[in-house]
Interface confidence: low
């Protein structure tokens, strides 16, 4: 009998493992999962199990490769493939992701449901368990405050409009004796907007004033630090290749000095780099590393550390460019903390143009995504695109960040 009980436990564990991995690689999560998308590019879609077991929710289930492989080999979904040497898995190339058309987005929206009334200490597992017999669920998004506290409400995506409709239309649903408010996501937004109309202008104005004050402080600090950057400007000029771009400069100086700003447009024959430290040092290091001959795309380049009036003028221009860039972002109504209109090289840890794991690091960009994170799905370096902690927007706007928008 005990053996039978063990078998049942194992089967339950295997089902959970399959469900978790198939969620990670599923239609809902994968397009939003920056880290996994990066991994998939690296080795024909194969992701080492070594990396998979660092994902929090899988890690809690098992870290045993054999158990994972065994579980996936029994999966009915046939979404995943296991490599010959059983050390890697991938989403089967025969099951490509659906194209994200307007029609597809609309379909997802129509099977998304809002549920409110859970205790704020409920865990994702509690909610999953409660939803178990409520229809096929593809994604659960626990809504959170800015400080990551669960609000007691969730968004759920069902596999079909029919199952979502059936769920919404089931009367008297409770979670542990508590009545739940259940609405289609769209209806929830409509209701919320209606409630907000009264105090919207006032709240908006207050938020805007606070935001502007905060932003001004940030800008002032930034301007001040820029004005202190005497000796940090490096001019480059020459018969540059038309394809020369800022990325080339970033690569050239990647180990020699941190670039704060690059004033250069593709096709131009000259530009200016603003370093965090002294430009002379960065130039010296880069020259040493390149046997004294510092070229861009095999073209000779004249490098000159700016001084005096020329430097002041260049600094003034950079300050103006940054200001203009900030204003552009402000006019888009977006919270902005960057340093420029794409003229800035990728910063360490920004994830831009970089593989997001480095050797010994065991915390992955996906850890938060696959655990319980804020309602807007923004994790790591991606900043929150909204000012208020409880402000909702339609799904189409919400999912602008590339990071995951779900828990599971």
């Amino acid at each position: 009998m005990a053996e039978n009980g063990d078998n049942e436990k194992m089967a339950a564990l295997e089902a959970k493992i399959c469900h978790q991995i198939e969620y990670y690689f599923g239609d809902f999560n994968l397009p939003r999962d920056k880290f996994l998308k990066e991994q998939i590019k690296l080795d024909e879609g194969w992701v080492p199990l070594e990396i998979m077991i660092k994902f929090n929710r899988l890690n809690r289930l098992t870290t045993d490769f054999n158990v994972i492989v065994e579980a996936l080999s029994k999966s009915k979904a046939e979404l995943m493939e296991i490599s010959e040497d059983k050390t890697k898995i991938r989403r089967s190339p025969s099951k490509p992701l659906p194209e994200v058309t307007d029609e597809y987005k609309n379909d997802v929206k129509n099977r998304s449901v809002y549920i409110k009334g859970f205790p704020t200490d409920a865990t994702l597992d509690d909610i999953k368990e409660w939803l178990e017999d409520k229809g096929q669920v593809l994604n659960i998004q626990m809504r959170r405050t800015l400080h990551k506290a669960f609000k007691g409400s969730i968004f759920v995506v069902f596999d079909s409009i029919e199952s979502a409709k059936k769920f919404v239309e089931t009367p008297g649903q409770k979670y542990k004796e508590t009545d739940l408010l259940i609405l289609f996501k769209d209806d929830y937004f409509a209701k919320k907007n209606e409630e907000r109309k009264q105090n919207k202008v006032e709240a908006k104005l207050r938020a805007k004033q606070e935001q502007e004050a905060k932003q001004k402080l940030e800008e002032d600090a930034e301007m001040k630090s820029l004005e202190e950057k005497i000796g940090c400007l490096l001019k480059f000029s020459g018969d540059l290749d038309d394809q020369t771009c800022r990325e080339d400069l970033h690569i050239l100086f990647s180990n020699h000095g941190e670039i704060k700003w690059i004033d250069f447009v593709r096709g131009a024959k000259e530009g200016i780099i603003l370093f965090k430290e002294k430009a002379k040092e960065a130039l010296g290091k880069a020259k040493d590393a390149n046997n004294g001959n510092l070229q861009l795309r095999n073209k000779e380049v004249t490098w000159e550390v700016l001084e005096g009036e020329v430097e002041k003028e260049a600094l003034k221009k950079i300050i103006e460019d940054q200001q203009e860039s900030l204003n552009k972002w402000k006019s888009k109504g977006r919270r902005f903390k960057g340093k420029g209109k794409g003229n800035k090289a990728a910063q360490p840890g920004s994830g831009k143009g970089k593989v997001q794991f480095q050797g010994k690091k065991t915390k992955f960009a996906s850890d938060d995504e696959h655990d319980e994170h804020d309602e807007n799905g923004a994790t790591g370096p991606v900043k929150r695109a909204r000012e208020e902690t409880d402000k909702e927007e339609p799904a189409s706007k919400q999912q602008k960040t590339e990071n995951g928008a779900g828990d599971q």
Epitope: K41, S83, P93, E247, G353
Partner: antibody, heavy 119, light 105 residues
Framework: QVKLEESGPELVKPGAPVKISCKTS????????IYWVKQRPGQGLEWIGY????????AYNQKFKDKATLTADNPSNTAYMQLSSLTSEDSAVYLC????????????WGQGTTLTVSS | QIVLTQSPAIMSASPGEKVTMTCSAS?????MYWYQQKSGTSPKRWIY???KLASGVPARFSGSGSGTSYSLTISSMEAEDAATYYC????????FGTGTKLEVK
């Protein structure tokens, strides 16, 4: 367009090392794997190893682990393969190839470098 | 590791003739890839994902198969098709077949 250009033919004495280059153009070097493949006269193709210039990661076919060392110079968009302690068995054409970004194949190849090991 | 065996090793065909060469895997694989290599040149991607033709490959070529058995077919041989064809699979690492040399009669 995408191009992979390998260095010229090499005649090397046994025991010496050799370094072959594969200069790429027409695409973002750091976004694609470069693989090296060995082909002996009248024989098939044998995978040696790869480098991913994006993070410097490398992997080798066990058979070539102590023979080949792969490096990349990102500013010049060039991949290199150094072969050590050469013997006549190493005489072959060495090809570099770019692996498709999400494909399971090699989409572009270098023209090959002929290595002759002889005293 | 998987071993890919191509047969025949050498074959010849007259222009207009139908040609089929096979690639047998020692254990099941998901996809097969084919390359064409002419004497003194590097290989060219020819067929990918078992049956898709790479750009510039004439429509007379086709690929098929599954599991352990795959094939490349030329519906009507032309002189320019004379070359060595290699199959290749990719599980954790690339593995090439032994090659089939196709000559024109």
């Amino acid at each position: 367009q995408v191009k992979l250009e390998e260095s010229g033919p090499e005649l090397v004495k046994p025991g010496a090392p050799v370094k072959i280059s594969c200069k790429t153009s027409g695409y973002t070097f750091t976004n694609y794997y470069i693989y090296w493949v060995k082909q002996r006269p009248g024989q098939g193709l044998e995978w040696i190893g790869y480098i991913y210039p994006g993070n410097g990661g490398t992997a080798y076919n066990q058979k070539f682990k102590d023979k080949a060392t792969l490096t990349a110079d990102n500013p010049s968009n060039t991949a290199y393969m150094q072969l050590s302690s050469l013997t006549s068995e190493d005489s072959a054409v060495y090809l570099c190839a770019r692996r498709g970004a999400l494909g399971y194949y090699f989409d572009y190849w270098g023209q090959g470098t002929t290595l002759t090991v002889s005293s | 590791q998987i071993v890919l065996t191509q047969s025949p090793a050498i074959m010849s065909a007259s222009p207009g003739e139908k040609v089929t060469m096979t690639c047998s895997a020692s254990s099941s694989v998901s996809y097969m890839y084919w390359y064409q290599q002419k004497s003194g040149t590097s290989p060219k991607r020819w067929i990918y994902d078992t049956s898709k033709l790479a750009s510039g490959v004439p429509a007379r070529f086709s690929g098929s198969g599954s599991g352990t058995s795959y094939s490349l077919t030329i519906s009507s041989m032309e002189a320019e098709d004379a070359a060595t064809y290699y199959c290749q699979q990719w599980s954790s690492n690339p593995q090439f077949g032994t090659g089939t040399k196709l000559e024109v009669k």
